[in-house]
């Protein structure tokens, strides 16, 4: 099964401070961050489509989620599957197409005021704090009204960047996804060679802020390809 591939037990670089500078070499950490397969289904045509193996939703496209292709099938074999549209069954938010979220086991529109709220108990992913299952049962708890209308602050658990407040993006931090600051000018950024490759990172940086792009630092042009430092620079 794919689980046997989950053996990448070292994190080569420690993360930079939130929204900050580059990491430093660090000691190995026991981790199984996901499967680093080359390519992805982003550039595969329909007539040449091959299922893209995955371990995390982030490894799939924005209109996909990671799951076993057959219900009750081998839990170890997971591939990127097309997201579920409104009124389709779901088990977690990532299964629903953008603009929807999983409520009571059904994908529903997120165009409701309370969806944007940072939920009590520092939750931004649970949206209404429902206990959602495929069976569709729900145990609602009362939310304080002051929590509605506010988006996730720095460090809040999130699903997508739209869950985070202005100036923040939703990025992976080891086994969780949290709101992190969008990068400022001069800060180190990650240049993705391939669309979608950001999902493979254990520690994910945000993108560069408005008017900035992630480009190789001028004084690093002579460095080897692998050690080139990218920073957020003005267009």
């Amino acid at each position: 099964t794919l689980n046997s591939v989950l053996n990448s037990n070292a994190i080569k670089n420690l993360p930079p401070p939130l929204g900050g500078a580059a990491g430093h070499p660090g000691s190995a950490v026991s981790a199984a961050p996901g499967i680093l397969y080359p390519g992805g289904n982003k550039y595969q045509t329909i007539d040449n489509y091959q299922p893209y193996p995955c371990a995390e939703d982030e490894e799939c496209g924005t209109d996909e989620y990671c799951a076993s292709p057959t219900r009750g099938g081998d839990a170890g074999v997971q591939i990127c599957l097309a997201c579920r549209k409104r009124r389709k069954r779901c088990m977690r938010h990532a299964m629903c197409c953008p603009g929807n979220y999983c409520k009571n086991g059904i994908c529903v529109s997120s165009d409701q005021n309370h969806f944007r709220g940072e939920i009590e108990e520092t939750i931004t992913e649970s949206f209404g704090n429902d206990h959602s299952t495929l069976d569709g049962y729900s145990r609602r708890t009362t939310l304080s009204s002051k929590m509605y209308h506010t988006k996730g602050q720095e460090g809040s658990v999130c699903l997508r960047s739209s869950d985070c407040a202005s100036g923040l993006c939703c990025a992976r931090h080891f086994w969780s996804k949290i709101c992190k600051p969008v990068l400022k000018e001069g800060q180190v950024c990650t240049k993705h060679r391939r669309k979608g490759s950001h999902g493979l990172e254990i520690f994910q940086r945000c993108y560069c802020g408005e008017g900035l792009s992630c480009r190789i630092q001028k004084d690093h042009h002579q460095a080897s390809n692998s050690s080139r430092l990218h920073t957020c620079q003005r267009h």
Partner: antibody, heavy 118, light 107 residues
Framework: EVQLLESGGGLVQPGGSLRLSCAAS????????MSWVRQAPGKGLEWVSA????????YYADSVKGRFTISRDNSKNTLYLQMNSLRAEDAAVYYC???????????WGQGTLVTVSS | DIQMTQSPSSLSASVGDRVTITCRAS??????LNWYQQKPGKAPKLLIY???ALQTGVPSRFSGSGSGTDFTLTISSLQPEDFATYYC?????????FGGGTKVEIK
């Protein structure tokens, strides 16, 4: 209300195995990363392992790497910790905890006691 | 691994006292610092996350500050129910590590 309830602890001989379970309710379990944290009698807290919401990524403390396996069944809202080759130093109260903001442990179970003794 | 050093390891105080506990990380952890309260025989309870954010339901007499390597938990006016052990924890880089704890006892 978020609730986490651990079970499966008990007395086991050195070299033996145990499987701990943590039943979760009151929140959308599949959306949250979860961890196991332990506390030896009279000692401080020690993080043991963590798993992402989908179960695709697992992390371990060096002290348990290769012996413990964290897993989850999102259809059952349950977190597991399979503990093999148990040692005396593994004896502790084991808590399951949910990952909240800044990867803090925002909700904890009541704990289950694991005793390793011959 | 990142070492978390808490001080003092224990302190005696009276109801109404202002209590300060410090936590130092062996390297910068940005604001990935959380504080917990634990009473005997009970599970820990989250007080402060992200160095300074008060967890929902926690009394406002608890506050946290700091960034980088040095952090502080302050109880502005100690109440009878605050006598417990307090732990800091870094969540910046695995393995997540806790401080040794500070036991707050009645004077």
């Amino acid at each position: 209300e978020v609730q986490l309830l651990e079970s499966g602890g008990g007395l086991v001989q050195p070299g033996g195995s145990l499987r701990l379970s943590c039943a979760a309710s009151g929140f959308t379990f599949a959306n949250y990363a979860m961890s196991w944290v332990r506390q030896a009698p009279g000692k401080g807290l020690e993080w043991v392992s963590a798993i992402s919401g989908s179960g695709g990524s697992a992390y371990y403390a060096d002290s348990v790497k290769g012996r413990f396996t964290i897993s989850r069944d999102n259809s059952k809202n349950t977190l597991y910790l399979q503990m093999n080759s148990l040692r005396a130093e593994d004896a502790a109260v084991y808590y399951c905890a949910r990952s909240g903001s800044f990867l803090s442990f925002d909700s904890w179970g009541q704990g289950t006691l694991v005793t390793v003794s011959s | 691994d990142i070492q978390m050093t808490q001080s003092p390891s224990s302190l005696s105080a009276s109801v109404g006292d202002r209590v300060t506990i410090t936590c130092r990380a062996s390297q910068s952890i940005s604001r990935f610092l959380n504080w917990y309260q634990q009473k005997p025989g009970k599970a820990p309870k989250l007080l402060i996350y992200g160095a300074s954010a008060l967890q929902t339901g926690v009394p406002s007499r608890f506050s946290g500050s700091g960034s980088g390597t040095d952090f502080t938990l302050t109880i502005s006016s100690l109440q009878p129910e605050d006598f417990a052990t307090y732990y800091c924890q870094q969540s910046y880089i695995p393995p997540l590590t806790f401080g040794g704890g500070t036991k707050v006892e009645i004077k």
